[in-house]
């Protein structure tokens, strides 16, 4: 006569996080009298999941009605599965005994693996801006996924990048995993409108990868180019000098005019012209009353951009002999030029 056998037909079961896991177990006999219990893990540290005899197990339901006569099906369903539920589950038959029930026979075990979606990738850029031709690093992080196998790709404006390093932690077995990747990107002047994308593919995403993005506009600083020119005279005793500040990013810019090294006026750029590549242009005009000057004047346009060290461009304004003769008071008039395109 055959002794009771505990049959766990599935060696492994894979379930998506949030779903219910059904763990199957059947007995070949009603003998001996005693409860079945489900455990996660084996040995002294095993965790009780369900006890037919007693206890409250809110997440566990039995597939069959265990009070039904001649029931030999002791399968259970565990609700709201999380990665922490992963492990090997054993269906164990106990024999009624005093003072305690005695373990009689165990099933072979069913390994429960939990498929957990990775979190939305978070892409972060450098703490400080860098200028074109320099290399900046972007990091991408995602957490809480299982199983460990995962694919991460980097793109810049749709073009796949190759200079990156990726780590999946921890290296050993875990209920869930995290991925961390660092990509190195060489900046170009046209990168204000550029975007880097971190793309993650995982079995739980069913071919629809997750993407995290970062704008290079947060990482780049394009320093301005300066050009100081004299415009045609409006009047005999006035000179019109312009400072064209071109192709800079970001917006933050302060311009100072100096006459022979002395500060004439400081202004902050407000209404800017945006170029197609995302950089900005700005023009400042200075009207110089030439009759107020006996000697030639060196006009300097000094620009402080995005908190960086100032750059400047000078222009020597020649005062004609006629103007020098008539010059008296050292007064000058300067007018802000309206914003105008190049």
């Amino acid at each position: 006569e055959d002794e009771l056998q505990v049959i766990q037909p599935e060696k492994s079961v894979s379930v998506a996080a949030g779903e219910s896991a059904t763990l199957r177990c059947a007995m070949t006999s009603l003998i001996p009298v005693g409860p079945i219990m489900w455990f996660r893990g084996a040995g002294a540290g095993r965790e009780l999941i369900y006890n037919q005899k007693e206890g409250h197990f809110p997440r566990v339901t039995t597939v069959s009605e265990l009070t039904k006569r001649n029931n030999l099906d002791f399968s259970i369903s565990i609700s709201n599965i999380t990665p922490a539920d992963a492990g090997t589950y054993y269906c164990v038959k106990f024999r009624k005994g005093s003072p305690d029930d005695v373990e009689f026979k165990s099933g072979a075990g069913t390994e429960l693996s939990v498929r957990a979606k990775p979190s939305a990738p978070v892409v972060s850029g450098p703490a400080v801006r860098a200028t074109p031709e320099h290399t900046v690093s972007f990091t991408c992080e995602s957490h809480g996924f299982s199983p460990r196998d995962i694919t991460l790709k980097w793109f810049k404006n749709g073009n796949e990048l190759s200079d990156f390093q990726t780590n999946v932690d921890p290296a050993g077995d875990s209920v869930s995993y995290s991925i961390h990747s660092t990509a190195r990107v060489v900046l170009t002047r046209g990168d204000v409108h550029s975007q880097v994308i971190c793309e993650i593919a995982h079995i739980t995403l069913q071919g629809d990868p997750l993407r995290g993005t970062a704008n290079l506009s947060e990482a780049i600083r394009v320093p301005p180019t300066l050009e100081v020119t004299q415009q045609p005279m409006r009047a005999e005793n006035q000179a019109n000098v312009t400072c064209q500040v071109s192709n800079f990013y970001p917006r933050g810019l302060q311009l100072t005019w100096l006459e022979n090294g002395n500060v004439s006026r400081t202004e902050t750029a407000s209404t800017l012209i945006e170029n197609k590549d995302g950089t900005y242009n700005w023009m400042s005009w200075l009207l110089v009353n030439t009759c107020a000057h006996r000697d030639d004047v060196v006009l300097t346009c000094q620009v402080e951009h995005d908190g960086q060290q100032a750059v400047s461009k000078s222009y020597a304004l020649e005062i004609s002999a006629h103007q020098k003769e008539h010059g008296s008071d050292i007064t000058h008039e300067a007018a802000l030029a309206p914003t105008a395109p190049l």
Epitope: E1, D2, E3, L4, T28, S29, L30, I31, P32, V33, G34, P35, Q52, K53, E54, L66, T67, R69, N70, N71, L72, R95, K96, G97, S98, P99
Partner: antibody, heavy 115, light 111 residues
Framework: RQLVESGGGLVQPGGSLRLSCAAS????????ISWVRQAPGKGLEYIGT?????ITYYASWAKGRFTGSKTSSTAYLQMTSLRAEDTAVYYC????????????WGQGTLVTVSS | DIVMTQSPSSLSASVGDRVTITCQAS????????LAWYQQKPGQAPKLLIY???TLATGVPSRFSGSGSGTDFTLTISSLQPEDFATYYC???????????FGQGTKVEIK
Amino acid sequence: RQLVESGGGLVQPGGSLRLSCAASGFSLSSHGISWVRQAPGKGLEYIGTIGTGVITYYASWAKGRFTGSKTSSTAYLQMTSLRAEDTAVYYCARGSAWNDPFDYWGQGTLVTVSS
Amino acid sequence: DIVMTQSPSSLSASVGDRVTITCQASQSVYGNNDLAWYQQKPGQAPKLLIYLASTLATGVPSRFSGSGSGTDFTLTISSLQPEDFATYYCLGGGDDEADNTFGQGTKVEIK
């Protein structure tokens, strides 16, 4: 589905008797067979349960004198050193108690121990 | 060994009456629910009514119900029928697999 007992009868004190319990309509392989007796005009008394070869157990008063065995179709109760107080109707029932209650019963067989 | 005490030992009732029989165990039964109720009519084998304290056996009319846990259990017949006049036994199981004991029985007679 039924259980049919046989083997009862008159036996002298100190004698032995083997009762049989034949199952029809189901196999005994996955079920325990329990034996219960009822003395004339008295209540029910549990004797023991025959599971498999390694799983048989008896009420404390029945140990030593009563032994059971079974095949897939028939269960047996061997009784020795019979006494007058063993006179009763002997029932076999399918089940082992708790979640495997005694759901099918034989019609009973009378054992009379008398000289 | 576990001792099962039934009360009353007998009772008289009429058809349609609600009948309650109690069974008390000398210690908590196994799993707090190893308690079955059987009905026996003269000259017949017992018949299973209730097991696991409150589970109705297949084919048993719903007027029979069981309740209780631990040491105190009750069999209730909500509306006594002519065929219900019989003797009722509880069977309790202790922690040892061989420790199964019947109560002394309750005879339900026609008033």
